[in-house]
C-alpha cells in the first residue's frame, strides 16, 4: 500500500482554482526526492503536468505550480483557470518516475449553473441555517408573505404568513419581520439538508402588483480535512460545530458505507474496538470539543465525522465536521508490546517510546478511565510526584535522547489492571497505550526481602537482605531508595555472584543492604531489583520504618505493603529470553544510575541512557556516605 | 417591545356571550400570529384561537369550533375574541399572546414571545 495520501475527490467550477494537499511519509529521502503531478491516460500511463524539478506542462503554463513543504512532509498542486478539460484522474506521486509511489485524485470541474440575473445566492454547510432575505414595496405591506421552493413546473410552498408551513419544513422554517422596517421580511430555514438546496421565490402580495425575488440556495457537504498519521501514534480531531448545538450531546462516528457508526460520545457510548485508546473532551461553552485516539492502527484508517444532537448520534440537517484519516504504515514509532502481563505481588517494568528529537520533553504515564466521557489522570511525571495512592511502587525513569523512558510498578494487585498511556507534553504523536493485565500468582515471589518486619532503631545497624533464585545468577542485583521523584540506587555488592563455585546454591543466593547508623532519613521505601545490562527487570519493595530505642518495644509493621509484598510470582515474568510475542512482562530499561554515572554516558547505546531524575532527588544522593555500606553474608 | 393589554372578562350565564378584546402597542409590524390561551384552574394553559396579520387566516381549537371567532382590526391594533354558546367549562383566565414569526405551529403557548396580563372569564350554571 502506497504510504502516499492526498483528496480521493476534488471539484470545482470553471475559471475557478483547486489546491491539492499530498503527504509524505517523514524520511529524508522523502523530502528532498521529486515530486510530481501527472495525468493518468487510457492506456494507464500517466503524464506528467508539473513535477518539483521545474518541469511545467504547456497546458499548465502560467496557471499551475507545485510547492513542497518539507517541515510538514506534504507538497501543494495549485492549478487555476480551470476548464472542463481538466476533469479527469491524476496521481500526485514521490520518485523519479512516475512509477513511484502515488496516490490517485480524481478532478471534476463543472459549468457554472446558469442562474436568473436576479438570483441571490446563498451558501450554506449542512446542518447550519440560512436567513433569506425577501424586499418588497411599500404597498404590499399588509399583504401575506411567502416562500416556495421551485420544483419542475411549479413553486411549491415553503412557508407564508398565515402560518402555512410545508410539512418538511415545520419546525425548521420561520418567517418574520425585523424592527420597523416595512420593505423586508425574512426566511429563516434551520438544520438545512442535500434536500433544501436549489432555487426558490420570495414573494409579497398577489397578482401582476405582487414582489418576486429568486434565491438560490446551495448546501455543502464540508470538506473532508485530511489527517496523515503514522501507525501506533495517536490523532486528535478538534471539531467547532458552533455556539447554537453548545449544549447538544456531541459524537463522533467512522463512516461504513452508507451508515455512521459511533466511535463515541458525550452520553457513554463507546466503541469497544477503542477501549483504552479513545477520550472525548469537552474544551468550552461554545460547542467545541476534541476526541484524542492513541495506538493508532491500519484500520483505524477512514471517513470520520463529529457532530452534535440530543440523542448523541448522526441527524440528518445537524452541523457536522468531517475528517479523511490515513494511517501510515512507516511509522517512525517503534513497535511495542501493547499489553504487558504481570501476577499479583509482582512487578512490571514498561517501556514508552517518545520522540527522540524532544528528548527534553516532559514525560507523563497516566491511567485511562472510561467513566462518563473518559479521562487519563496522570499517575506519575518527570516533573509531577507519584499520586499518593501509588507511593513506594510506582517510579518513572526518563533517559534523555534515547526515545525511552521506563516505568515500573511494583506491588502489584488485579485493581491495577487495566490500560495506561505513555504521553509527554512534546509531540503529541507519540501517546501510546498500553494494557496491564495482572493474573493471580500461582508459585512463590522470584525476590523475597528479609526480614519482613522491617522496622530499625535509631543509630543502631540495619540489615536486610533480598533473596532471588538461580536464575537470577547471571543477572545483576541492586537495592534503592524510592521517593516519589525516583529511585536513587545505592553501591551494593552481590555475594552470590562472588562466589566461585558453578553450582548455585538457592539458599545463599542474596543481595544485602546495611544501614549504618539508622537515622530517621533512612525511613521509607526500598526496592530491590535485578538488571540485565540496562534492561531491568523484577523489583520487590520494602517499607523501612524507624523507631527510636525503647525498652522491651515491640516492632510493628506500619503498612501491609511488605505483606503484598510476599505473594508470588511467575517465574517466566522476568525471563529475559522470552519473545515479545508472547507479551510477558519481560525487563524493559529502567534507568536507575546515580548522578555521577549520568554526567559519563554521552551518546552511547540508548538503553544505556540514565536519568537525573532517578538519582538526583534531593537528600536522597547519600550512597557515597560511610553510613550506606553493603556488604554479604 | 410590544404590550398587550386584554379586557372585556367577566361573569356570564352557561349560553351566553362574552367579546374580549386584546390592544396591542409598541413594535407591532413585527407581530405575524396573536392568540388566545386560556388556563384554568390546575389545569395546563391551553389554546383557543389564532389569527394570522399578514394575509388574514384563522385558526382554532377543536373545543371552542363553530361557537368562537377571532377578528382584527389593523386600524385599531386590537384583536377580539367573540365567545358565543359559553360552558362551565370555559371559566378560566384568558390570556392575549403575540408572535413576531410564523413557523406553521400555533397553537403551542412557548412559541409566543409576547403575553398580556390576562382577563378572567366565570361562567355560571
Known amino acids: 500500500k502506497s504510504p502516499i495520501f492526498g483528496p480521493q475527490e476534488v471539484s470545482s467550477i470553471e475559471g475557478d482554482s483547486v489546491s491539492i494537499t499530498c503527504y509524505y511519509p517523514d524520511t529524508s529521502v522523502n523530502r528532498h526526492t521529486r515530486k510530481y503531478w501527472c495525468r493518468q491516460g487510457a492506456s494507464g500511463m500517466c503524464t506528467t503536468l508539473i513535477s518539483s524539478n521545474g518541469y511545467l506542462s504547456k497546458e499548465y503554463s502560467g496557471r499551475a505550480n507545485l510547492i513542497n513543504f518539507p517541515e510538514n512532509n506534504t507538497f501543494v498542486i495549485n492549478i487555476e483557470q480551470l476548464t472542463q478539460d481538466d476533469t479527469g484522474s491524476y496521481k500526485c506521486g514521490l520518485g523519479t518516475s512516475n512509477r513511484g509511489l502515488s496516490f490517485d485524485v480524481s478532478l471534476e470541474v463543472s459549468q457554472v449553473p446558469e442562474l436568473p440575473s436576479d438570483t441571490h445566492v446563498y451558501t450554506k454547510d449542512i446542518g447550519r441555517n440560512v436567513t433569506i432575505e425577501c424586499p418588497f414595496k411599500r404597498e404590499n405591506a399588509p399583504s401575506k408573505k411567502s416562500l416556495c421552493k421551485k420544483t419542475n413546473q411549479s413553486c411549491e410552498l415553503v412557508i407564508d404568513s398565515t402560518e402555512k408551513v410545508n410539512p418538511s419544513y415545520i419546525g425548521r422554517a420561520k418567517l418574520f419581520m425585523k424592527g420597523t422596517d416595512l420593505t423586508v421580511f425574512y426566511v429563516n430555514i434551520s438544520h438545512l439538508t442535500h434536500n433544501d438546496a436549489g432555487l426558490y421565490i420570495c414573494q409579497a402580495g398577489e397578482g401582476p402588483s405582487a414582489d418576486k425575488k429568486n434565491v438560490d440556495l446551495q448546501v455543502l457537504a464540508p470538506e473532508p480535512e485530511l489527517l496523515y498519521k503514522d501507525l501506533r501514534s495517536s490523532v486528535t480531531f478538534e471539531c467547532d460545530l458552533g455556539r447554537e448545538v453548545a449544549n447538544e450531546a456531541k459524537y463522533l462516528c467512522r463512516m461504513n458505507k452508507e451508515t455512521c457508526d459511533v466511535i463515541i460520545n458525550t452520553l457513554g457510548k463507546r466503541d469497544p474496538d477503542f477501549e483504552g485508546r479513545i477520550l472525548i473532551t469537552p474544551k468550552d461553552d461554545n460547542g467545541r470539543f476534541s476526541v484524542l485516539i492513541t495506538g493508532l492502527r491500519k484500520e483505524d484508517a477512514g471517513h470520520y465525522q463529529c457532530g452534535a444532537h440530543s440523542s448523541g448520534l448522526p441527524q440528518e440537517g445537524w452541523p457536522i465536521q468531517t475528517w479523511q484519516l490515513f494511517v501510515n504504515e512507516e511509522s517512525t514509532i517503534p513497535n511495542r508490546r501493547s499489553v504487558v502481563k504481570g501476577v499479583t505481588g509482582g512487578s512490571v517494568a514498561i517501556a514508552c517510546p517518545y520522540n527522540p528529537k524532544e528528548s527534553s520533553s516532559l514525560k507523563y504515564w497516566c491511567r485511562w478511565e472510561g467513566d462518563g466521557n473518559g479521562h487519563c489522570p496522570v499517575l506519575v511525571g518527570t516533573q509531577a510526584q507519584v499520586q499518593e495512592e501509588y507511593e513506594g511502587r510506582l517510579a518513572l525513569f526518563d533517559q534523555p535522547g534515547n526515545g525511552t523512558y521506563t516505568v515500573i510498578l511494583n506491588q502489584l494487585t488485579t485493581e491495577d489492571a487495566g490500560f495506561y498511556w505513555c504521553l509527554t507534553n512534546g509531540d503529541s504523536r507519540w501517546r501510546t497505550t498500553i494494557e496491564l493485565q495482572v493474573a493471580e500468582a500461582t508459585r512463590e515471589p522470584n525476590l523475597e526481602v528479609t526480614p519482613q518486619n522491617a522496622t530499625a532503631v535509631l543509630g543502631e545497624t540495619f540489615t536486610v537482605s533480598c533473596h532471588y533464585p538461580c536464575k537470577f545468577y547471571s543477572q545483576e542485583k541492586y537495592w534503592c531508595k524510592w521517593s516519589n521523584k525516583g529511585c536513587h540506587i545505592l553501591p551494593s555488592h552481590d555475594e552470590g555472584a562472588r562466589q566461585s563455585s558453578v553450582s548455585c546454591d538457592q539458599s545463599s543466593q542474596l543481595v544485602s543492604m546495611t544501614l549504618n547508623p539508622v537515622s530517621k532519613e533512612d525511613e521509607g521505601w526500598y526496592w530491590c531489583g535485578v538488571k540485565q545490562g540496562q534492561t531491568y527487570g523484577e523489583t520487590t519493595a520494602i517499607y523501612i520504618a524507624v523507631e527510636e530505642r525503647t525498652r522491651g518495644s515491640s516492632h510493628v509493621n506500619p503498612t501491609d505493603a511488605n505483606a503484598r509484598a510476599k505473594v508470588a510470582l511467575e517465574e517466566e515474568v522476568v525471563d529475559s529470553s522470552i519473545s515479545e510475542k508472547e507479551n510477558k512482562a519481560i525487563p524493559n530499561p529502567g534507568p536507575f544510575a546515580n548522578e555521577r554515572e549520568i554526567q559519563n554516558v554521552g551518546d552511547q547505546a540508548q538503553e544505556n541512557r540514565a536519568s537525573g531524575d532517578a538519582g538526583s532527588a534531593d537528600g536522597q544522593s547519600r550512597s557515597s556516605s560511610s553510613k550506606h555500606h553493603h556488604h554479604h553474608h | 417591545q410590544v404590550q398587550l393589554v386584554e379586557s372585556g372578562g367577566g361573569l356570564q350565564q352557561a349560553g351566553g356571550s362574552l367579546r374580549l378584546s386584546c390592544a396591542a402597542s409598541?413594535?407591532?409590524?413585527?407581530?405575524?400570529?396573536v392568540g388566545w390561551f386560556r388556563q384554568a384552574p390546575g389545569k395546563e394553559r391551553e389554546f383557543v384561537a389564532a389569527?394570522?396579520?399578514?394575509?388574514?387566516?384563522?385558526y382554532y381549537a377543536d373545543s371552542v369550533k363553530g361557537r368562537f371567532t377571532i377578528s382584527r382590526d389593523n386600524a385599531k391594533n386590537t384583536v377580539d375574541l367573540q365567545m358565543n354558546s359559553l360552558k362551565p367549562e370555559d371559566a378560566a383566565v384568558y390570556y392575549c399572546?403575540?408572535?413576531?414569526?410564523?413557523?406553521?405551529?400555533?397553537?403551542?403557548?412557548?412559541?409566543?414571545?409576547?403575553w398580556g396580563q390576562g382577563t378572567q372569564v366565570t361562567v355560571s350554571s
Open positions: 409598541g413594535r407591532t409590524v413585527t407581530v405575524m400570529t
Open positions: 389569527i394570522t396579520m399578514y394575509g388574514e387566516r384563522t
Open positions: 399572546a403575540a408572535r413576531t414569526y410564523v413557523s406553521g405551529i400555533y397553537d403551542r403557548f412557548d412559541d409566543y414571545n409576547y
